[in-house]
């Protein structure tokens, strides 16, 4: 059967800091999260079956003034979907998206979402992971911050 | 045959106000809009066939100063794609996206688009609908504001 | 076999100016770029097989103060995915997205990405192309600026 995964953020273990970090905590079997013929391990989505896959990610960032004091109003809110090959140790960004934002103190609430998607050849054993900047701003809802993949066709 | 739908906004009946509202007027059979083995009824896209579907939405907001003055320059421009189960009356958000925006009077034109997409298990009889904030700011073009679904695979 | 394409920007030949232009230089056979049972010619993605396709585009814009001064701080950063039919000479926009942005001199770096996607009936011979505003601001990375398509099902 065709492999797929839809992984939703597990917000119990989100790093702080503004630098780019890999998000390693995702749900794969609760709510909208699900996986079949792929493996989730050590924060990475592992391909078990060669093929062409459609990959996607939706990442939401938010800040409310009650959450704390932003260190800067000038933010880079970014997502990077990366592929790691274990056989030939290397990591490459497949897709990136995001925006620089000016989140001033004049507004009590700020929100921004990124969506990326694309069609990629994936080999068994390759790993997909998601990196973001400013992870402490992530929206922890399952409808907000997620990524996934589904196989569309075999490699000829 | 595999079900699909691509529904484009019917702008003749867009609600006013800035609160979150469900958009009920969509075209299903003109221009780019089309539907097969799914049903569009009462503003909702109804699933006729169990399966895993890729769902997507593209929502564009725009304002020109000739349209009148905005009630506030601080806007939350949001989309929510929801699933309603009739058997167990409940509604849940599958995907959300958007941004807070500062649309100042210094610029005569403002525009912003949201795209969301994800892979979900849908059962026959379940209904997909789209909610947005600030519906009066929606771009009424068929290439701008639309949502859709296509079945990728059966449920095992 | 099911047709697909994933085309990444060829930044050696990006037009200047702020007006809407068609992007004609894309890679189809290096890095993440690939094509099968579709044709890339004269800057357009040509459909060889009737069917329903999922089309997508990811477009990233960026500016660093070291690149020079922006002519205006108020920008319209837009993408348009268009379909051209040769038999009946006509061009229509399938999808659009983007945002107006205020990229002030107070920040040394600015970034913004757009993602659009949708499900469309395409006939053999039809051509897909991508237009953007402000092409000189495009991010030339293969993970940043790309578009693609994959066939999901036949036309009944």
């Amino acid at each position: 059967a065709q492999p797929f995964a839809h992984l939703t953020i597990n917000a119990t273990n989100i790093p702080t800091g503004s630098h780019k970090v890999s998000l390693s905590s995702w749900y794969h079997d609760r709510g909208w999260a699900k996986i079949s013929n792929m493996t989730f391990s050590n924060g990475k989505l592992i391909v078990n079956q060669d093929g062409f896959y459609y990959l996607y990610a939706n990442i939401c960032f938010r800040h409310h003034e009650t959450s704390g004091d932003l260190a800067t109003e000038y933010l880079q809110l970014m997502v990077y979907v990366t592929k790691t090959s274990i056989k030939i140790p290397s990591s490459h960004t497949l897709m990136k998206g995001g925006s620089t934002k000016y989140w001033s103190g004049n507004s009590e609430f700020h929100f921004y979402s990124i969506n990326v998607g694309g069609f990629f050849k994936l080999r068994s054993g390759e790993e997909i992971s998601v990196e973001v900047s400013n992870p402490s701003l992530l929206d922890p809802d399952q409808d907000a911050t997620y990524f996934g993949a589904f196989k569309v066709r075999d490699i000829d | 045959a595999q079900p699909f739908a691509h529904l484009t906004i019917n702008a003749t009946n867009i609600p006013t106000g800035s609160h979150k509202v469900s958009l009920s007027s969509w075209y299903h059979d003109r221009g780019w809009a089309k539907i097969s083995n799914m049903t569009f009824s009462n503003g909702k896209l109804i699933v006729n066939q169990d399966g895993f579907y890729y769902l997507y939405a593209n929502i564009c907001f725009r304002h020109h100063e000739t349209s009148g003055d905005l009630a506030t320059e601080y806007l939350q421009l949001m989309v929510y794609v929801t699933k309603t189960s009739i058997k167990i009356p409940s509604s849940h958000t599958l995907m959300k996206g958007g941004s807070t925006k500062y649309w100042s009077g210094n610029s005569e034109f403002h525009f912003y688009s949201i795209n969301v997409g994800g892979f979900f298990k849908l059962r026959s009889g379940e209904e997909i609908s789209v909610e947005v904030s600030n519906p009066s700011l929606l771009d009424p073009d068929q290439d701008a504001t639309y949502f859709g679904a296509f079945k990728v695979r059966d449920i095992d | 076999a099911q047709p697909f394409a994933h085309l990444t920007i060829n930044a050696t030949n990006i037009p200047t100016g702020s007006h809407k232009v068609s992007l004609s230089s894309w890679y189809h056979d290096r890095g993440w770029a690939k094509i099968s049972n579709m044709t890339f010619s004269n800057g357009k993605l040509i459909v060889n097989q009737d069917g329903f396709y999922y089309l997508y585009a990811n477009i990233c814009f960026r500016h660093h103060e070291t690149s020079g001064d922006l002519a205006t701080e108020y920008l319209q950063l837009m993408v348009y995915v268009t379909k051209t039919s040769i038999k009946i000479p006509s061009s229509h926009t399938l999808m659009k997205g983007g945002s107006t942005k205020y990229w002030s001199g107070n920040s040394e770096f600015h970034f913004y990405s757009i993602n659009v996607g949708g499900f469309f009936k395409l006939r053999s011979g039809e051509e897909i192309s991508v237009e953007v505003s402000n092409p000189s601001l495009l991010d030339p990375d293969q993970d940043a600026t790309y578009f693609g398509a994959f066939k999901v099902r036949d036309i009944d």
Epitope: T16, G17, S18, H19, S67, G68, D69, L70, A71, T72, E73, Y74, L75, Y102, S104, G105, N134, P135, S136, L137 | - | N106
Partner: nanobody, 126 residues
């Protein structure tokens, strides 16, 4: 390395005003947030106010909100604390501090600040 030097403290009657200054030297001043803290005799150092690098956002302890104003002049590499409607309980040594770490959120915990001035005494008499 960042050097911070405060000035502007003194003795003032309740209801009066003072303006503290903190002059910075060293690395690019405009790139990092700054904070004011105070320490009264026998008490732990407490957060008063902070400001982002651009000066676009300011944050205050509830006890000083509406009375104190933090600001900065990046051209002069200086941060200010305007203190109005002073009360006896505002008596303390006031210190400015620089927040260098690349965090999304500014801490109000003085231990997270990296560079400190020597402090300036503010005494409010009743």
């Amino acid at each position: 390395e960042v050097q911070l030097v405060e000035s502007g403290g003194g003795l003032v009657q309740a209801g009066g005003s003072l303006r503290l200054s903190c002059a910075a030297s060293g690395r690019t001043f405009r790139s990092y947030p700054m904070g004011w803290f105070r320490q009264a005799p026998g008490k732990e150092r407490e957060f008063v106010a902070s400001i982002t690098g651009s000066g676009g956002s300011t944050y205050y302890a509830d006890s000083v909100k509406g009375r104190f104003t933090i600001s900065r002049d990046n051209a002069k590499n200086t941060v200010y604390l305007q203190m109005n409607s002073l009360r006896p309980e505002d008596t303390a040594v006031y210190s400015c501090a620089a927040y260098i770490r690349p965090d999304t959120y500014l801490s109000r915990d003085y231990r997270k600040y990296d560079y400190w001035g020597q402090g300036t005494q503010v005494t409010v008499s009743s």
